[in-house]
């Protein structure tokens, strides 16, 4: 058993049918010695008397808010949560496996640049009685500071019969140098509590590996005289690290017909312009990627050909 | 993704082309190592990230873009002394900082070159003959060093009398390649920045 926060305790259980559970001793936070009784949640049934209460915690029915009273007055509370260990592996019931970039990915994180700011998000099908708290650091043995905000519900989607809820959090490394070569990864830890179930999820990454630039901005077409060709131009996104000559991007320019089946013409360039043939009803899209470290491509910025 | 091959303009900063080739070569070598050593811990998540140049060179600090020198988090630089002559310094306006930066890059390349050559000698003794260093990568390191053209003491190749532990050598190769790829990215960024300046 360990303390999650004041008066909230997590009991770790080896979770299998007929498991013996864990013996837990609760102590009433009071100078009083006599006439103390204990109850669980809203029930008035007296579970025991005395300054301490010994209970065998086996299932969720044994978890909850234990309260000690004296003469009708509440003295203190202890909330017991359960953390299930199933065959040596901590349960992951609360969050959905996003399966990207690999199986057992519960937290996904992205950064728009090298400033040390990043966003993480996760999915769940649970809509109520759910709380999250997020901590982060650079490295784990001698951790350096990363400050995270509160997790917020950022999207709701309908997936088949189920509603899916997306939560996200923004974090900022306290003293980040955009040009630094990372040798210690960022660690993100999310505590999730659903009703009386506690779970924790972690992700470990280098900022360089989660970079995903914003799409190029000011995408414009300039028709070339007496030609089907157009000059496409764009700019670096505002959120990208500066100077751009140091944090350079490379670009992919795509000409896509109305039908998804039509052949796509693609050009790769390090410049912020390109000459392409504009077909009728086609659209031109441009996306960006770090020129020197191949992390994710940005989303496409698009303009119609006409 | 292979980086597009740059054809340097005549007036182009002389080292940019070499640094692009270096990054391409080390990225290819790392990819090959990951595939060949699939049963070894060779991914970024599995290895310890060690920097053999730590406390010996200060490339990131010495090569910091002017715009980032206002960022206090970037200025924990270490005192390091370097030789300051070299042929990449194409203009008379080259500052002392730029000379320091390029000599730091040269020292990095020299250190990695020694490590890679020592490692290759061990890998050639492996009866499994599983992996060797790409000669192209070693050649590209050499070319960039020549383009930088710093006169510096030659570091003797490390020789080891004891029987090499091939498992450890291959893991060390992965660690070295990951670190060298990160340094090659920094070198490419620096050359691109200097070229634009």
């Amino acid at each position: 058993i360990w303390e999650l926060k004041k008066d909230v305790y997590v009991v770790e259980l080896d979770w299998y049918p007929d498991a013996p559970g864990e013996m837990v001793v609760l102590t009433c936070d009071t100078p009083e010695e006599d006439g103390i009784t204990w109850t669980l949640d809203q029930s008035s049934e007296v579970l025991g008397s005395g300054k301490t209460l010994t209970i065998q915690v086996k299932e969720f029915g044994d978890a909850g808010q234990y309260t000690c009273h004296k003469g009708g007055e509440v003295l203190s509370h202890s909330l017991l949560l359960l953390h299930k260990k199933e065959d040596g592996i901590w349960s992951t019931d609360i969050l959905k496996d996003q399966k990207e970039p690999k199986n057992k990915t519960f937290l996904r994180c992205e950064a728009k640049n090298y400033s040390g700011r990043f966003t993480c998000w996760w999915l769940t099908t649970i809509s109520t009685d759910l709380t999250f708290s997020v901590k982060s650091s650079r490295g784990s043995s001698d951790p350096q500071g990363v400050t995270c905000g509160a997790a917020t519900l950022s999207a709701e989607r309908v997936r088949g019969d189920n509603k899916e809820y997306e939560y996200s959090v923004e974090c900022q490394e306290d003293s980040a140098c955009p040009a630094a070569e990372e040798s210690l990864p960022i660690e993100v830890m999310v505590d999730a509590v659903h009703k009386l179930k506690y779970e924790n999820y972690t992700s470990s990454f280098f900022i360089r590996d989660i970079i995903k630039p914003d799409p190029p901005k000011n995408l414009q077409l300039k028709p070339l005289k007496n030609s089907r060709q157009v000059e496409v131009s764009w700019e670096y996104p505002d959120t990208w690290s500066t100077p751009h000559s140091y944090f350079s991007l490379t670009f992919c320019v795509q000409v896509q017909g109305k039908s998804k089946r039509e052949k796509k013409d693609r050009v790769f360039t390090d410049k912020t312009s390109a000459t392409v043939i504009c077909r009728k009803n086609a659209s031109i899209s441009v996306r960006a990627q770090d020129r020197y470290y191949s992390s994710s491509w940005s989303e496409w910025a698009s303009v119609p050909c006409s | 993704r292979n980086l597009p091959v740059a054809t340097p303009d005549p007036g182009m900063f002389p080292c940019l082309h070499h640094s692009q080739n270096l990054l391409r070569a080390v990225s290819n070598m790392l990819q090959k190592a990951r595939q060949t050593l699939e049963f070894y811990p060779c991914t970024s998540e599995e290895i310890d990230h060690e920097d053999i140049t730590k406390d010996k060179t200060s490339t990131v600090e010495a090569c910091l873009p002017l715009e980032l020198t206002k960022n206090e988090s970037c200025l924990n630089s270490r005192e390091t002394s370097f030789i300051t002559n070299g042929s990449c310094l194409a203009s008379r306006k080259t500052s002392f900082m730029m000379a320091l930066c390029l000599s730091s890059i040269y020292e990095d390349l020299k250190m990695y070159q020694v490590e890679f050559k020592t490692m290759n000698a061990k890998l050639l003794m492996d009866p499994k003959r599983q992996i060797f260093l790409d000669q192209n990568m070693l050649a590209v390191i050499d070319e960039l060093m020549q383009a930088l053209n710093f006169n510096s003491e030659t570091v003797p190749q490390k020789s080891s009398l004891e029987e090499p532990d091939f498992y450890k050598t291959k893991i060390k190769l992965c660690i070295l390649l990951h670190a060298f790829r990160i340094r090659a990215v920094t070198i490419d960024r620096v050359m691109s920045y200097l070229n634009a300046s």
Epitope: W15, P17, D18, A19, E86, D87, G88, I89, D93, T125 | -
Partner: antibody, heavy 115, light 112 residues
Framework: QVQLVQSGGGVVQPGRSLRLSCAAS????????MHWVRQAPGKGLEWVAF????????YYADSVKGRFTISRDNSKNTLYLQMKSLRAEDTAVYYC????????WGQGTMVTVSS | SYVLTQPPSVSGTPGQRVTISCSGG????????VKWYQQLPGTAPKLLIY???QRPSGVPDRFSGSKSGTSASLAITGVQAEDEADYYC????????????FGTGTKVTVLG
């Protein structure tokens, strides 16, 4: 005391369907994940499928994906394996088992796919 | 599709020490715990070892398990006639959990 009692096995022709049941007693069935494991005659153990305690997630071996469906009725304390498009290579003893560091197995039920 | 490899058979005379190996990789045994089962002919598997080296109550202490790196082993010290059975190791793969990975199985024969 934990008990898993299996039923539903038998002889079936290739291409036909069969549903296996596993009735649980002696524990809070709705709190635990459950597996199906099979063993072809004279062969080793092969995992078939898993279902979460609440039925929210199901996992299958590639060899049965798209043909077999694992399900559970927590109000009846029963686990099911619906097997469709059966093949000769599905012939095996099928076991249900609880998920956890200590596990409990059903007695097994024989499924023979033969024309 | 077995990724946990066991020797097909091992044998010993009563009282001898018999060991069975179970060889896997970094993503399974290297990252997860190992169980061992005993299966007597015509019966369901019985749990002998969980969490690499833990014995459930009721399992004789002549059975012991260990794990090192990407391999695990089961030892029977002082093998007895009633130990003649098939033995299976089981683990998980970190990418496919909760799918169970079983070893190829080992037939233990007690001679004489």
């Amino acid at each position: 005391q934990v008990q898993l009692v299996q039923s539903g096995g038998g002889v079936v022709q290739p291409g036909r369907s069969l549903r296996l049941s596993c009735a649980a007693s002696g524990f809070t069935f709705s709190s635990y994940g459950m597996h199906w494991v099979r063993q072809a005659p004279g062969k080793g153990l092969e995992w078939v499928a898993f279902i979460r305690y609440d039925g929210s997630n199901k996992y299958y071996a590639d060899s049965v994906k798209g043909r077999f469906t694992i399900s559970r009725d927590n109000s009846k304390n029963t686990l099911y394996l619906q097997m469709k498009s059966l093949r000769a290579e599905d012939t095996a003893v099928y076991y249900c088992k609880t998920h956890g560091s200590h596990d409990n197995w059903g007695q097994g039920t024989m499924v023979t796919v033969s024309s | 599709s077995y990724v946990l490899t066991q020797p097909p058979s091992v044998s010993g005379t009563p009282g001898q020490r018999v060991t069975i190996s179970c060889s896997g990789g970094r993503s399974n045994i290297g990252s997860n715990t190992v169980k061992w089962y005993q299966q007597l002919p015509g019966t369901a598997p019985k749990l002998l070892i969980y969490m690499n080296d833990q014995r459930p109550s009721g399992v004789p202490d002549r059975f012991s398990g260990s794990k090192s790196g990407t391999s695990a082993s089961l030892a029977i010290t002082g093998v007895q006639a009633e130990d003649e059975a098939d033995y299976y190791c089981q683990s998980y793969d970190r990418g496919t959990h909760p799918a169970l990975l079983f070893g190829t199985g080992t037939k233990v024969t007690v001679l004489g």
